[in-house]
């Protein structure tokens, strides 16, 4: 598998959880693989085992410690290697020297809830989650709405550039059943990419006044 | 432009010892893993080492533990490979490689590696 593809992937959650994937194109399926981590500026060690998510991909979450805690800051480095059994021993296959803030990728927002709807708009609210205080306001939003008969790819991006845990929702089809998603991204991190999308939440336009003549 | 340029390469007697260097410039030095490879004649190109960015963390192929040393001098880009106790079946060509973020994979795999030096001879006798 010397020549196959492979590709080791992992993320900050910004407060105590590195999330990773190793992808190698030819590995076996059963083969025994783990993430360890080596911070150079911090007592604590840790692994986590890869198991695997598809055919040639494995993931693990390295858990520093309680959800909210502060485990790394901007100046640390953690080297992540690779290891996968091969007989008796350990073999590294990759390794890194991870720049956490320099990878982040946020928890998706939870706790989606409409704040106030009528027939033609809706106010939404949601809260970020495991998010560090480093970023301050250093946040950046996207969201997306479902109408009906269509796919949530063709839904048009609507992007808060500030820290903005709230949208008005307008122009909407009264007596309508919409479904919304919003994710977050912090603005540092020369690889830092878009937290997952949050779960769908459902909501139902009000139906337009009947007119006096009908 | 990108350059990498491994020098140190020579004939010596097994047992010997040979110091190898790679000279980097055009690319951010600092940040990339750095390996060395090599190739003898009439087989494929091997991993021989890797060094992270820091230079806190190494990794050696087994045919080359103990006798191989890489280091790193982020200050002047250059990348080192000390080679003890060398054996005849260490007669190759010697490449330095560098693997920039974000990091690719299996860290022995030549397609890993985004940027290569030209090589140097390494030929041991006995």
């Known amino acids: 598998a010397v020549n196959g593809t492979s590709q080791f992937t992992c993320f900050y959650n910004s407060r105590a959880n590195i999330s990773c994937v190793w992808s190698q194109d030819g590995a076996l399926q059963d083969t025994s693989c783990q993430v360890h981590a080596w911070p150079d500026r911090r007592r604590w060690n840790q692994t986590c085992e890869l198991l695997p998510v598809s055919q040639a991909s494995w993931a693990c979450n390295l858990i520093l410690g309680a959800p909210d805690s502060q485990k790394l800051t901007t100046v640390d480095i953690v080297t992540l290697r690779v290891l996968c059994r091969e007989g008796v021993r350990w073999r590294v296959m990759a390794i890194q020297d991870f720049k956490p803030f320099e990878n982040l990728r946020l928890m998706a927002p939870i706790s989606l809830q409409v704040v106030h709807v009528e027939t033609h708009r809706c106010n939404i609210s949601w809260e970020i989650s495991q998010a560090s205080h480093y970023f301050e306001r250093h946040l950046e939003f996207e969201a997306r709405t479902l109408s009906p008969g269509h796919t949530w790819e063709e839904a048009p991006l609507l992007t808060l550039k500030q820290k903005q845990e709230w949208i008005c929702l307008e122009t909407l089809t009264p007596d309508t059943q919409y479904e919304f998603q919003v994710r977050v991204k912090p603005l540092q991190g020369e690889f830092t990419t878009w937290s997952p999308w949050s779960q769908p939440l459902a909501f139902r336009t009000k139906p337009a006044a009947l007119g006096k003549d009908t | 432009q990108v350059q990498l340029q491994e020098s140190g390469g020579g004939s010596v007697q097994a047992g010997g010892s040979l110091r190898l260097s790679c000279v980097t410039s055009?690319?951010?030095?600092?940040?990339?893993?750095m390996a060395w490879f090599r190739q003898a004649p009439g087989k494929e190109r091997e991993g021989v080492a890797i060094?992270?960015?820091?230079?806190?963390?190494?990794t050696y192929a087994d045919s080359v533990k103990g006798r191989f040393t890489i280091s790193r001098d982020n200050a002047a880009n250059t990348l080192y490979l000390q080679m003890n106790s060398l054996k005849p079946e260490d007669t190759a060509m010697y490449y330095c490689a560098a693997d920039t973020p974000p990091y690719s994979g299996l860290w022995y795999a030549e397609r890993t590696y985004n940027y290569w030096g030209q090589g140097t001879q390494v030929t041991v006798s006995s």
């Open positions: 055009g690319y951010t030095y600092s940040s990339a893993n």
């Open positions: 060094i992270t960015p820091s230079g806190r963390a190494t």
